[in-house]
Interface confidence: medium
């Protein structure tokens, strides 16, 4: 990834005109904000579709839906919004929201195949998944307080998670 | 690698139609935007307008409108120009050029000389 | 339409000598300002993207800086392939602008 963002770029765009857009993109003038999973790109001057640009250098200006799309690729996995991480389910097993119950049921139904991820959980330890960036900003849990994100999953103070900067 | 590769010289009257065509190789042709240029003899470059081959969405340049139409063939990755009601102020080579999401165009067609001449 | 300035519109040169083109925005256009290189009867090729990135197998003697609406190509050492037209063009703004271009010729 570039780590050159496209998203600082609000500008003043002017759409001129309006063209037809398929597929829920909009047109109109200054037309900045846009429906999720999509991006202002001020040079074509509409909204375009994350998908498209997942795989490209500028990545950064879809950064959490393309972490969320290549996070859900990877089996026992999940992608937080609220954390904007992707969460292993490894980690969490045992106080786990819905998205990882599978994982976790069948990991627990037979708890030889422990994986490192939960052993390490158990002693207090959180995966954490980075993008390319490296950048981190610690989001605080007061407590073990519920995140809304995750049903029913506590994180204790030595549980805090890293979401992206 | 890349390749844009463009259709011949054309040579029509005033008032006729021209379709230039843009096949495009070596990438996913509905993950990137096309984009037409056009270059008048001796002069600089212009940009006409874009389309989107994924959904075929487009849009022109304000001085193109009603000239210009932009469509694709996803099957054949190949998007093409027309240019309607053609005179003089047509004759110019064009340009396919792929849009590389952060401003810039990174692979180029050969370009299409279009003369308009009666 | 943001209106891209060149200068100058042509310039003599060497083989060998250091060449400097200028740039300049009529708006604030970040660091969104590439570079291309055309000679007569072919394509414009991309040299360099987002002012200094250098697009895949342009050579390094080519260098650009600047930012906001001033920009600069830099060719530190001309070679006998570099006489050819050099335009640059804004990538910040919609719609996409070019500027009118420079003819660096041999002397």
């Known amino acids: 990834m570039s780590g050159l963002g496209r998203s600082r770029r609000g500008g003043r765009s002017r759409v001129d005109q309006e063209e037809r857009f398929p597929q829920g993109l909009w047109t109109g003038v200054a037309m900045r904000s846009c429906p999720e999973e999509q991006y202002w790109d001020p040079l074509l001057g509409t909204c375009m579709s994350c998908k498209t640009i997942c795989n490209h250098q500028s990545q950064r200006t879809c950064a959490a839906f393309c972490r969320s799309l290549s996070c859900r690729k990877e089996q026992g996995k999940f992608y937080d919004h609220l954390l904007r991480d992707c969460i292993s389910c490894a980690s969490i097993c045992g106080q786990h929201p819905k998205q990882c119950a599978y994982f976790c049921e069948n990991k627990l139904r037979s708890p030889v195949n422990l994986p490192p991820e939960l052993r390490r959980q158990r002693s207090g330890e959180v995966e954490n998944n980075s993008d390319n960036s490296g950048r981190y900003q610690g989001l605080e849990h007061r407590g073990s307080e519920a995140s809304p994100a995750l049903p029913g999953l506590k994180l204790s103070a030595d549980q805090v998670a890293l979401v992206y900067s | 690698q890349v390749q844009l590769v463009q259709s011949g010289a054309e040579v029509k009257k005033p008032g006729a139609s021209v379709k230039v065509s843009c096949k495009a190789s070596g990438y996913t042709f509905t993950n990137y935007v096309m984009h037409w240029v056009k270059q008048k003899p001796g002069q600089g470059l212009e940009w006409m307008g874009y389309i989107l081959p994924y959904n075929d969405g487009t849009k022109y340049a304000q001085k193109f409108q009603g000239k210009v139409t932009m469509t694709s063939d996803k099957s054949t990755s190949t998007v093409y120009m027309e240019l309607s009601s053609l005179t003089s102020e047509d004759t110019a080579v064009y340009y396919c050029?792929?849009?590389?999401?952060?401003?810039?165009?990174?692979?180029w067609g050969q370009g299409t000389l279009v003369t308009v001449s009666s | 339409d943001i209106q891209m300035t060149q200068s100058p519109s042509s310039l003599s040169a060497s083989v060998g000598d250091r060449v400097t083109i200028t740039c300049r925005a009529s708006?604030?256009?970040?660091?969104?300002l590439s570079w291309y290189q055309q000679k007569p009867g072919k394509a414009p090729k991309l040299l360099m993207r987002?002012?200094?990135r250098l697009h895949s197998g342009v050579p390094s003697r080519f260098s650009g800086s600047g930012s906001g609406t001033d920009f600069t190509l830099t060719i530190s050492s001309l070679e006998q392939e570099d006489f050819a037209t050099y335009y640059c063009?804004?990538?910040?703004?919609?719609?996409?602008?070019f500027g009118g271009g420079t003819k660096v010729e041999i002397k």
């Open positions: 063009q804004q990538g910040n703004l919609f719609p996409p602008t």
């Open positions: 987002y002012t200094s």
């Open positions: 050029a792929r849009y590389d999401w952060e401003g810039s165009f990174d692979y």
């Open positions: 708006q604030d256009i970040s660091n969104y």
